[in-house]
C-alpha cells in the first residue's frame, strides 16, 4: 500500500506565446497520492470547468484555450490539492501575439491648400506594429511637413498641391504585415486669377476681347460683371486645360465700362472667389457724345425686328429724351399708317422706314448713322409705292395729312447720298434687291416723273426697265 504524498508540481508553468485564434496550452504535471484536485485561475479568478472556451484534461493537468483572443492574455495558475500537506501552485503568463491589424483605417480626405491634413491609421498587434505610409507606388518620406505620429496617423502641415494622390498605411511586426485600402487625398485650391483682363482705350464701336485666366481645384467658374451688373451683351468663350480656366469676353464697345472677372470655386459648403477688373474707355468719348448727337446699339424693339439685319448696330438719336422708346413709338405709329397700303408697297415701305429711322451705324471715332441710298428710296417712292406716295403728297398739299406726315418718318430721297457716287456712304435695302427681281408687272406709275426715272438698283438683271441716263447725283 502506497503512502500518502503531498502534491508536487513537477513541470512548472512557463510563459506561453500564442497567436490570436490559435490554441494555447498550459501543462501542470503533478505527483501526489492520492490523486490531487487541480483548479485553474486566470488573473486570480477561477476558471469554471463548464466554460466552453477552455478544455481541461488529464485530470486537470492540461488547460487548453481553444481559440485565443487578445483579451486572454494574463497570468494563469494551476493549484493542486489532495488533502495531504498544503495546496501547491505554479503560474505562467500567456502572451497573446497578434499579427498587425488596422483598426481605424485612413479615409478619403479633401483639404484646402495650406491647411493641415491628418490621415488616421490606428493599429493593433503584438509585438506593437510599426506604421509606415505609401504614396502612389513609393514609400513616403517624412520631412519637416510630413510626419507619422505615434498613433500611426499621417500628419501633413501646410498641404501643397503636390501632396494630392493615393495613400495607404502599412502596419508591420514580426508576425506579418497589414495594408490599408488606398485612400485619396484631394487638395483643393482657392480660386486665383493668373491673368487679369487688360484695360483698353478704343474707338467707339470697336470689338474688344477681355481675357481672364484663373486656376483652382476644383476648376473655378468665371463670371463677368459690367458696371456692377451681369454682362448683358457680348459673347463668352471658355476653355479649360490643366485646372486652368480661360474666359474671353468679346464686346461691342458703345460706352465706357468697368468689367470685372470673378473666379469662383466651391469647398464643401463654402465658396472662394477672386476678382480682377479692367476698364474699357472710349477714345475721345466726350467728343463723340457731343458730335454724334446719338449712340449706336443693337436694336431691341419689335416692330423692325424682321426688317433690320440680325444683331446689327443701329443709331439712336439723343435729341430724344429716351431715344430707343421714342424711335420705336415713331415706327409703331408709321406701321399703323401703312396698314391700308397695297401688298406691293407695304413691305418695301416697311424696309425703307425701319432703315431710315434705325440707321445702320458706321465705325469711326464717333458713332455715325448711314442714311439709306437714294436709289432705294426712289425705288420705294416711284416703283413699289408710287400710288400711295402720290396720294400722301396730295393729302399733304390739301392740309389733310399734316399730322400724319409729321408722324411718318419718310426720308426726302433727294437729300440722300447715291450709292453710285459713294457705295460706302449709304445703306442698301436687301429686300428691294430681292423683290425687284420678282416683279414682272409694273405698278401703274402716274407720278409727275416719267417711269424711266425709276432708279437703277445694283443688279443689272432686274426685270424692270431702267434708264442709265437717270441722273443720280
Amino acid at each position: 500500500e502506497k503512502l500518502p504524498k503531498a502534491p508536487v508540481i513537477t513541470t512548472p508553468l512557463e510563459t506561453v506565446d500564442a497567436l490570436v485564434e490559435e490554441v494555447a496550452t498550459f501543462m501542470c504535471a503533478v505527483e501526489s497520492y492520492p490523486q490531487p484536485e487541480i483548479s485553474w485561475t486566470r488573473n486570480k479568478i477561477l476558471i469554471k470547468l463548464f466554460d466552453t472556451r477552455y478544455s481541461i484534461r488529464e485530470n486537470g493537468q492540461l488547460l487548453t484555450i481553444l481559440s485565443v483572443e487578445d483579451s486572454d492574455d494574463g497570468i494563469y495558475c494551476c493549484i493542486a490539492n489532495n488533502g495531504v500537506g498544503g495546496a501547491v501552485e505554479s503560474c505562467g503568463a500567456l502572451q497573446v501575439k497578434m499579427k498587425p491589424k488596422i483598426t481605424r483605417p485612413p479615409i478619403n480626405v479633401k483639404i484646402i491648400e495650406g491647411l493641415k491634413a491628418v490621415l488616421p491609421c490606428t493599429t493593433m498587434g503584438n509585438p506593437k506594429p510599426s506604421v509606415s505610409w505609401i504614396k502612389g507606388d513609393n514609400a513616403l518620406r517624412e520631412n519637416s511637413r510630413i510626419a507619422v505620429l505615434e498613433s500611426g496617423s499621417l500628419r501633413i502641415h501646410n498641404v501643397q498641391k503636390e501632396d494630392a494622390g493615393q495613400y495607404r498605411c502599412v502596419a508591420k511586426n514580426s508576425l506579418g504585415t497589414a495594408y490599408s485600402k488606398l485612400v485619396k487625398l484631394e487638395v483643393e485650391v482657392f480660386a486665383r486669377i493668373l491673368r487679369a483682363p487688360e484695360s483698353h482705350n478704343v474707338t467707339f464701336g470697336s470689338f474688344v476681347t477681355l481675357r481672364c485666366t484663373a486656376i483652382g481645384i476644383p476648376v473655378p467658374t468665371i463670371s463677368w460683371i459690367e458696371n456692377g451688373n451681369a454682362v448683358s451683351s457680348g459673347s463668352i468663350q471658355e476653355s479649360v486645360k490643366d485646372r486652368v480656366i480661360d474666359s474671353r469676353l468679346q464686346l461691342f464697345i458703345t460706352k465706357p465700362g468697368l468689367y470685372t472677372c470673378i473666379a469662383t470655386n466651391k469647398h464643401g459648403e463654402k465658396f472662394s472667389t477672386a476678382k480682377a477688373a479692367a476698364t474699357v474707355s472710349i477714345a475721345e468719348w466726350s467728343k463723340s457724345q457731343k458730335d454724334s448727337q446719338g449712340y449706336c446699339a443693337q436694336y431691341r424693339g419689335e416692330v423692325c425686328d424682321a426688317v433690320l439685319a440680325k444683331d446689327a448696330l443701329v443709331f439712336f438719336n439723343t435729341s430724344y429724351r429716351d431715344p430707343e422708346d421714342a424711335q420705336e413709338l415713331l415706327i409703331h405709329t408709321a406701321w399703323n399708317e401703312l396698314k391700308a397700303v397695297s401688298p406691293l408697297c407695304r413691305p418695301a415701305a416697311e424696309a425703307l422706314l425701319c432703315n431710315h429711322l434705325f440707321q445702320e451705324c458706321s465705325p469711326g471715332v464717333v458713332p455715325t448713322p448711314m442714311p439709306i441710298c437714294r436709289e432705294y428710296c426712289l425705288a420705294v417712292k416711284e416703283l413699289f409705292c408710287a400710288k400711295e406716295w402720290q396720294a400722301m403728297e396730295g393729302k399733304a398739299h390739301r392740309g389733310l395729312y399734316r399730322s400724319g406726315m409729321h408722324l411718318l418718318p419718310v426720308p426726302e430721297c433727294s437729300k440722300l447720298p447715291s450709292m453710285h457716287r459713294d457705295p460706302t456712304a449709304c445703306t442698301r435695302l436687301p429686300y428691294l434687291d430681292y423683290k425687284k427681281e420678282n416683279i414682272t408687272t409694273f405698278p401703274s406709275i402716274t407720278s409727275s416723273r416719267p417711269s424711266a426715272d425709276i432708279p437703277n438698283l445694283p443688279a443689272s438683271t432686274s426685270s424692270f426697265a431702267v434708264s442709265p441716263a437717270y441722273s443720280m447725283t
Partner: antibody, heavy 115, light 111 residues
Amino acid sequence: EVQLVESGGGLVQPGGSLSLSCVASGFTFSLYYMNWVRQAPGKGLEWLSVIDTHSIAYYADSVKGRFTISRDNVKNTLYLQLNNLKPEDTALYYCVLGRTALVRWGQGTQVTVSS
Amino acid sequence: EIVLTQSPSSVTASAGEKVTINCKSSQSVLYNQKNYLAWYQQRPGQSPRLLIYWASTRESGVPDRFSGSGSTTDFTLTISSFQPEDVAVYYCQQGYSVPYTFGSGTRLEIK
C-alpha cells in the same frame, strides 16, 4: 459724271503756307464725306484728313495742328490749308470722295517744299 | 493707329496666271457685320482707283477677275487671270477708324 479738280499746288519754302482747293461736280457735294490723300515721289499713299457732311474733320497725326480741311457746300469746293510746311510734305495731293473707302480720286496737285 | 502689312512687296506674273496679294491688319476691322477694308489699283502715272470695298464687294466697272476675301484681320486680293493692263501697284486701306491707313503697296509686273 463725278469730277474732282485740285488746284493751288506749287513750290513753297519750308515754314511757308499754301491753300489747296478741289472743285467737285457731277454729284450733290454736301451729302458726301471728302478726303485729302498724298503721295510722296516714289512712295506709297498717305491719308491726311476727312471732313464729314456736318463739317467735322479728322486728321492723321503727321499733319494735325498744321493742316486744316474745310468745305464750302455752296461752291462745291473742298479746301486744305497747309501751314508750317516741311520738306517731307513734298507730294502729290489728291482730293478724294468717300466715306470709309476712297471712291473717286482727282488727278492731284503737286506741292514742293524746298529752300 | 491700325497698321496694315501687305505682302509680297512685288510680284511678277505671266498673262493668264492667278495672282494673290495679302493684307494683314494689326487689329480687327470688322464692324456691324462689315469688314472695312478696301483695295486700290494705281497704274503708272495715274491716280489710284477703287477696286474692292467692304473686303469683298467689287466696285462697279471693275472686271470680275478681281475679287477680295477675308475677315477681321486677314485679307486677300485675287486676280484670277492676270492681264497686261493689270500692271500696277496695289494698296489695301482700312476705313474702320481714323486715321485711315494704307498698306505699303504691292508692285505687280509682267514676266
